[in-house]
Amino acid sequence: YFGKLESKLSVIRNLNDQVLFIDQGNRPLFEDMTDSDCRDNAPRTIFIISMYKDSQPRGMAVTISVKCEKISTLSCENKIISFKEMNPPDNIKDTKSDIIFFQRSVPGHDNKMQFESSSYEGYFLACEKERDLFKLILKKEDELGDRSIMFTVQNED
């Protein structure tokens, strides 16, 4: 069971300091941006991180949403990352959900975050280069010190 708590607005970056944004095709991508670029590209660079109470404490349970015309929420259904047009629900009556991730700091580094899927144990949000694009993907990872699964989250509230 997950029960919604508060939400915050955040900018998410990979460890190469590229900014996560949602492009015109609703794809989550990373790109080099100055602070003014980041502001100019809002709301596509501003993510709503909603925290949830978890009936089985496993870290901070969150959803990641973005509000452009409508609110879309990050999903890892079938291990594929996509934004689905939906509001983060107030309650989820299950111990796993394709839209819930566990946000945890990397040990010894409070500013570096990992996001593990609640649906797929050992699968993490990651940044992966595909041709010329830096994509947000779900990655099965047993190399937990891999920088590709670490992010910084800067609160904008």
């Epitope: 496993r58 040990p107 010894g108 144990e121 010190g145």
Partner: antibody
Framework: QVQLVQSGAEVKKPGASVKVSCKVS????????FHWVRRRPGKGLEWMGR????????KYAERFKDRVTMTEDTSTDTAYMELSSLRSEDTAVYYC???????????????????WGQGTLVTVSS | DIQMTQSPSSVSASVGDRVTITCLAS??????LTWYQQKPGKAPKLLIY???KLQDGVPSRFSGSGSGTDYTLTISSLQPEDFATYYC?????????FGQGTKLEIK
């Protein structure tokens, strides 16, 4: 309780290949990997590589990558490690081990080698 | 590759002694460090994971500490069954690397 049972000792000639098996008995959850580690006489533990039974993807240590092949048969819950072009320096005890997530009180994941096979002595001698 | 420098390579001690073994990583390994004990003719046995978390069934005289690049295994009061070889292992990045081992012998 998971147990790993390895195949028996082998004596091989230089240039030959050896294939060591590792059978899982007992209940094992999904989301684990098989790793192979060896210990040569008078030396320390040395990581050789790992295989993911879910998709058969492998990662090998650089010094073994041209000679080692790790495979897994999910129907029999058995992992295999084949080492080719054997030389006398490959004389060692070879271990299989499972690599699984353990979690701390906040749910943070840590991978550990928890269950180990009994070891297989491979002797390379002419 | 991440190098793990373990010291000392051997130590002689008596029952009841306090023993400390250290491992120094060549880069930050984020506490993704485990400690193993190995006795002759036996497979390694997990003692500590996550640098400081005691594996179930391991006596509380064993403890681990450290972060970043520096890690320590301490045995607070040596028992006869503790004489063995101890290894650290970094699990942060592939290739996984062990320390060279510390042989703990009876004085």
């Amino acid at each position: 309780q998971v147990q790993l049972v390895q195949s028996g000792a082998e004596v091989k000639k230089p240039g030959a290949s050896v294939k060591v098996s590792c059978k899982v008995s007992g209940e094992i959850s999904t989301g684990y990997y098989f790793h192979w580690v060896r210990r040569r006489p008078g030396k320390g533990l040395e990581w050789m590589g790992r295989i993911d039974p879910e998709d058969d993807s492998t990662k090998y240590a650089e010094r073994f990558k041209d000679r080692v092949t790790m495979t897994e048969d999910t129907s029999t819950d058995t992992a295999y490690m084949e080492l080719s072009s054997l030389r006398s320096e490959d004389t060692a005890v070879y271990y299989c081990t499972t690599w699984r997530i353990y979690r701390d009180s906040s749910g943070r994941p840590f991978y550990v080698m928890d269950a180990w096979g009994q070891g297989t002595l491979v002797t390379v001698s002419s | 590759d991440i190098q793990m420098t373990q010291s000392p390579s051997s130590v002689s001690a008596s029952v009841g002694d306090r023993v400390t073994i250290t491992c120094l990583a060549s880069e930050d390994i984020y506490t993704y460090l485990t400690w193993y004990q190995q006795k002759p003719g036996k497979a390694p046995k997990l003692l500590i994971y996550g640098a400081n978390k005691l594996q179930d069934g391991v006596p509380s005289r064993f403890s681990g500490s450290g972060s970043g690049t520096d890690y320590t295994l301490t045995i607070s009061s040596l028992q006869p069954e503790d004489f063995a070889t101890y290894y650290c292992l970094q699990g942060s990045k592939f290739p996984l690397t062990f320390g060279q081992g510390t042989k703990l012998e009876i004085k």
